[in-house]
């Protein structure tokens, strides 16, 4: 969390951003909130990116003002116009690219004063893993698949019964480049699994950590997966 204060002018206002990550090829949100004003026409929101000449986005007098917008962001940005009045200056970013990573500044002017805060935006690819029993294998085998990751992640297997065990000797992980030549499909196979145990396939890079769990018993198979973004720090 980054909290910024205005430094010049008669008053400063608090602006808060949250470091976040964008999944390439999808919508991203750059989060920013500020002390609200009662009049929409008095609010100016400017989004800037370090190293980019034009603005990322500008909203003033109740509408978008894109005359100074940098071409790399044209048609790709929008604020949540109906939420600006309550202090939400977050930016929606279309079709996140690797090149969108960097330091952004959310700069706010209201009738109460000015303020700004920086935001670190990371970009990559992350997806939920799915763990299945591989019935084609000669021995009891689990297969963990996740369709899109970038940068290349690490894959670690764990088990509820054998806590702390190292499964690197009985697993095999491969990374297959996807058709767009950036992201990769992650496939990890775990051999010699035992029944009545819960196994976890953990995939992690510097942007996200995802876990796929599978519980295999004589009568049923239960699956669960979750994904968590790393480094979501507020400013």
């Amino acid at each position: 969390l980054i909290i910024g204060f205005g430094i010049s002018g008669r008053h400063s206002i608090t602006v808060t951003t949250v470091a976040s990550a964008g999944n390439i090829g999808e919508d991203g949100i750059l989060s920013c909130t500020f002390e609200p004003d009662i009049k929409l026409s008095d609010i100016v929101i400017q989004w800037l990116k370090e190293g980019v000449l034009g603005l990322v986005h500008e909203f003033k007098e109740g509408k978008d003002e894109l005359s100074e917008q940098d071409e790399m962001f044209r048609g790709r940005t929008a604020v949540f116009a109906d939420q600006v009045i309550v202090g939400n200056a977050s930016l929606r970013l279309k079709n996140v690219q690797l090149t969108d990573a960097g330091t952004y500044k959310c700069y706010i002017i209201t009738s109460k004063g000015k303020g700004n805060a920086n935001l670190e935006y990371k970009t990559g690819a992350f997806s939920m893993p799915e763990v299945n029993v591989d019935y084609n294998a000669s021995s009891e085998t689990l297969r963990c698949e996740a369709p899109r990751w970038f940068p290349q992640p690490t894959v670690v297997w764990a088990s509820q019964v054998d806590q702390g065990a190292n499964f690197s000797e009985v697993s095999n992980t491969s990374f297959e480049l996807n058709s767009e030549n950036v992201t990769m499909k992650v496939v990890s196979v775990l051999y010699n699994v035992t029944i009545n145990n819960t196994y976890s396939c953990m995939i992690e890079n510097d942007i996200a950590k995802a876990t796929g769990d599978i519980k295999v018993t004589e009568s049923e198979i239960k699956r669960r997966s979750h994904l968590q973004l790393l480094n979501s720090k507020a400013s």
């Epitope: 090829g25 790709r76 079709n95 899109r148």
Partner: antibody, heavy 121, light 107 residues
Framework: EVQLVQSGAEVKKPGASVKVSCKAS????????IGWVRQAPGQGLEWIGD????????NYNEKFKGRATLTADTSTSTAYLELSSLRSEDTAVYYC??????????????WGQGTLVTVSS | DIQMTQSPSSLSASVGDRVTITCKAS??????VAWYQQKPGKAPKLLIH???TLQPGVPSRFSGSGSGTDFTLTISSLQPEDFATYYC?????????FGQGTKVEIK
């Protein structure tokens, strides 16, 4: 309610130009992109290009670059498509459509009724 | 430019059938695919955007899915009013592109 009302049918000779209008109402005209799509008789949809009335920014399908011109008059909330050097294969229904997502270029969510342009000698 | 290859170009089905239409993007990797329904003499109607988000008022029998370059429109149980032509649209890049269309006819 978002409404896009297009101008009436046109008959043009080969080599001539046509200008189709699209009057918008029910939303802030300058805040949304407007796209243009055409459909030849019995054929599929073909994207021509789009314009952001709030700044006049445009994007064009390579096929129409130099022949299609998109403009917008913010005082009347009207978008225009002008197509020059017409040929018989330009005979089609021309649609305008609002792009969802405000300044963000989304999918086309509201459409005009279409304007039939016939090119015949 | 990205091309969208839609298949099949036409299909015959009966009321109650499950219908699947696919679109394949020639390149790229994003979720910006929309699906439209068009009836003769009418403007297209947006059914689904961002791969799987249903437009308000569109019946839940319509669904969208896909990832990477392959996208699918599914009608779970075809109704009489669903006989029409369907188009996919790629709108993630600077240049938009429609698929060639799929005509759904009564068997």
């Amino acid at each position: 309610e978002v409404q896009l009302v297009q101008s009436g049918a046109e008959v043009k000779k080969p080599g001539a130009s046509v200008k189709v209008s699209c009057k918008a109402s029910g939303y802030t005209f300058t805040s949304y992109w407007i796209g243009w799509v055409r459909q030849a008789p019995g054929q599929g949809l073909e994207w021509i290009g789009d314009i952001y009335p709030g700044g006049g920014y445009t994007n064009y399908n390579e096929k129409f670059k130099g022949r299609a011109t998109l403009t917008a008059d913010t005082s009347t909330s009207t978008a225009y498509l002008e197509l020059s050097s017409l040929r018989s294969e330009d005979t089609a229904v021309y649609y305008c459509a609002r792009l969802d997502g405000s300044s963000y270029r989304g999918a086309m969510d509201s459409w005009g009724q279409g304007t039939l342009v016939t090119v015949s000698s | 430019d990205i091309q969208m290859t839609q298949s099949p170009s036409s299909l015959s089905a009966s009321v109650g059938d499950r219908v699947t239409i696919t679109c394949k993007a020639s390149q790229g990797f994003n979720k910006y695919v929309a699906w439209y329904q068009q009836k003769p003499g009418k403007a297209p109607k947006l059914l689904i955007h961002y791969t799987s988000t249903l437009q308000p008022g569109v019946p839940s029998r319509f669904s969208g899915s896909g990832s990477g370059t392959d996208f699918t429109l599914t009608i779970s149980s075809l109704q009489p009013e669903d006989f029409a032509t369907y188009y996919c649209l790629q709108y993630g890049n600077l240049l938009y592109a429609f698929g060639q269309g799929t005509k759904v006819e009564i068997k």
